[in-house]
Amino acid sequence: QPCPYPMAPPNGHVSPVQAKYILKDSFSIFCETGYELLQGHLPLKSFTAVCQKDGSWDRPMPACSIVDCGPPDDLPSGRVEYITGPGVTTYKAVIQYSCEETFYTMKVNDGKYVCEADGFWTSSKGEKSLPVCEPVCGLSARTTGGRIYGGQKAKPGDFPWQVLILGGTTAAGALLYDNWVLTAAHAVYEQKHDASALDIRMGTLKRLSPHYTQAWSEAVFIHEGYTHDAGFDNDIALIKLNNKVVINSNITPICLPRKEAESFMRTDDIGTASGWGLTQRGFLARNLMYVDIPIVDHQKCTAAYEKPPYPRGSVTANMLCAGLESGGKDSCRGDSGGALVFLDSETERWFVGGIVSWGSMNCGEAGQYGVYTKVINYIPWIENIISDF
């Protein structure tokens, strides 16, 4: 007994085509490009039916339905716009991703995606993953570089990368991207095995204010070349936050130095240090303070720290010094881990050139200088940690 002649579903065809189909004969259904085999909501890669001895097919005809890529995934810190038409998500539909202006910029591709025949939203470069809205770094309400101890009060948006680190001693750090904090190894050394003990606060000027954005640490990475209680070489650490922070005018990451950044960090170039460390009155600052200080010739700095009580070789090639020969302007205890920043006049973005590390016991002392970890020496280390974790 022959089986009923198989009528191809719309947008599909039957193969092989025969005059009649008898016991054990079979046919397959193939869909046109942009259409897929579906049995209800369940997708099929292939479909073959076999003629049974009672003259019926062993399974019902599927549909060739237009491929539907479904609603596109939400883009963190961005949005999606339907280009083809409101809510259209079927084959050849186009959508456009964009990032929240000012504070984020799109990485990976141009954000235009098309619903392809395989059912995935695909960029013009062939990527099926979402684009990335990366925080814009180095934005500040302060537009000039140049002219804490001997410092001035910061205003909202001046140092939006500034991070207050509690959980042990008071220290500082600088936001990188939206889920990393750059700081000094000595500031977080005690918490390296207990990252969750770090209380990380940002988006505030007042050290004791109850109004701040709270972040918590997921992991602490201390440079493997740092030896606690044996000098300050490689005094650098990264804290990975357990969540991304929302970027705004009061919370913005600092840029890492470009290869060309050394041209903005020559002797006498002005950097800016900020923090809540000790002021001239000998107390931790209530309000975030900042000080503009010039870079000091490396040999001059080395010489300043060659005499007792400082051991020979205290100042290494991984450090840079800043301050006035006459003293009075410096970072101090409590500022540790904070960023010494410089304005890149080509990109008009601020970048971190140094990390507050160490100095003389008497902050702002004449003939002594603040010593900072030279960040440009650690770019490969920073990039490796961030890409691996």
Epitope: Q39, G40, H41, L42, P43, L44, K45, S46, R59, P60, G70, D118, G119, F120
Partner: antibody, heavy 115, light 107 residues
């Protein structure tokens, strides 16, 4: 013969993420069909959670969409379920299954959400 | 979501009886309906797919019919091993949904 086997912790704390893996033998998950997760709370009816298709596309129950992720590891012929922010209401027997023309289910694994 | 409403919620019948379980969909599901049998403490076992197609190995006493919104599972001659809970399921649209179950017992 096609076989599916669920694996994962039997106890999950509230607010944590439930993670289960389904290992498939006797059939490649990239060959065809939709590979599903279905659960059954104690004394209750079955609830479809979502699937990952042969091509890697996913479809989720809208009631779980903000919490569920189904992924696969084709090299191990496995597909996995992650359900975040669990509560006591997520206590159930969890099954992996391939439905429709090929219909096979795992034996099920009981997951209890409790502190 | 498409609701699948089974009736009765439980029933008791004698060995050899003809048993009918019905399932009503809240909207058209074409013939994209499956029937499952679940014995206590066991995994659901598929009996029928596409409303009327029996899985291989399923006894011929089990049959399914219907399309659109009304579906029926029939056991032509009830056997002692058929004691179980039976579920209908629609796979026509997202989310796939199951009926609340029909518990079948032997008198």
């Amino acid at each position: 013969e096609v076989q599916l086997q669920e694996s994962g912790p039997g106890l999950v704390k509230p607010s944590q993420t439930l993670s289960l893996t389904c290992t498939v033998s006797g059939y490649s998950i990239t060959s065809d069909y939709a590979w599903n997760w279905i659960r059954q709370p104690p004394g209750n009816k079955l609830e479809w959670m979502g699937y990952i298709s042969y091509s890697g596309r996913t479809s989720y129950n809208p009631s779980l969409k903000s919490r569920i992720t189904i992924s696969r590891d084709t090299s191990k012929n496995q597909f996995s379920l992650k359900l975040s922010s669990v509560t006591a209401a997520d206590t159930a027997v969890y099954y992996c299954a391939v439905l429709y023309a090929l219909d096979y289910w795992g034996q099920g694994t009981t997951v209890t959400v409790s502190s | 979501d498409i609701q699948m409403t089974q009736s009765p919620s439980s029933l008791s019948a004698s060995v050899g009886d003809r048993v009918t379980i019905t399932c009503k969909a809240s909207q058209n599901v074409d013939t994209n309906v499956a029937w499952y049998q679940q014995k206590p403490g066991k995994v659901p076992k598929a009996l029928i797919y596409s409303a009327s197609y029996r899985y291989s190995g399923v006894p011929s006493r089990f049959s399914g019919s219907g399309s659109g919104t009304d579906f029926t599972l029939t056991i032509s001659s009830l056997q002692p091993e058929d004691v179980a809970t039976y579920y209908c399921q629609q796979y026509n649209s997202n989310p796939l949904t199951f009926g609340q179950g029909t518990k079948l017992e032997i008198k």
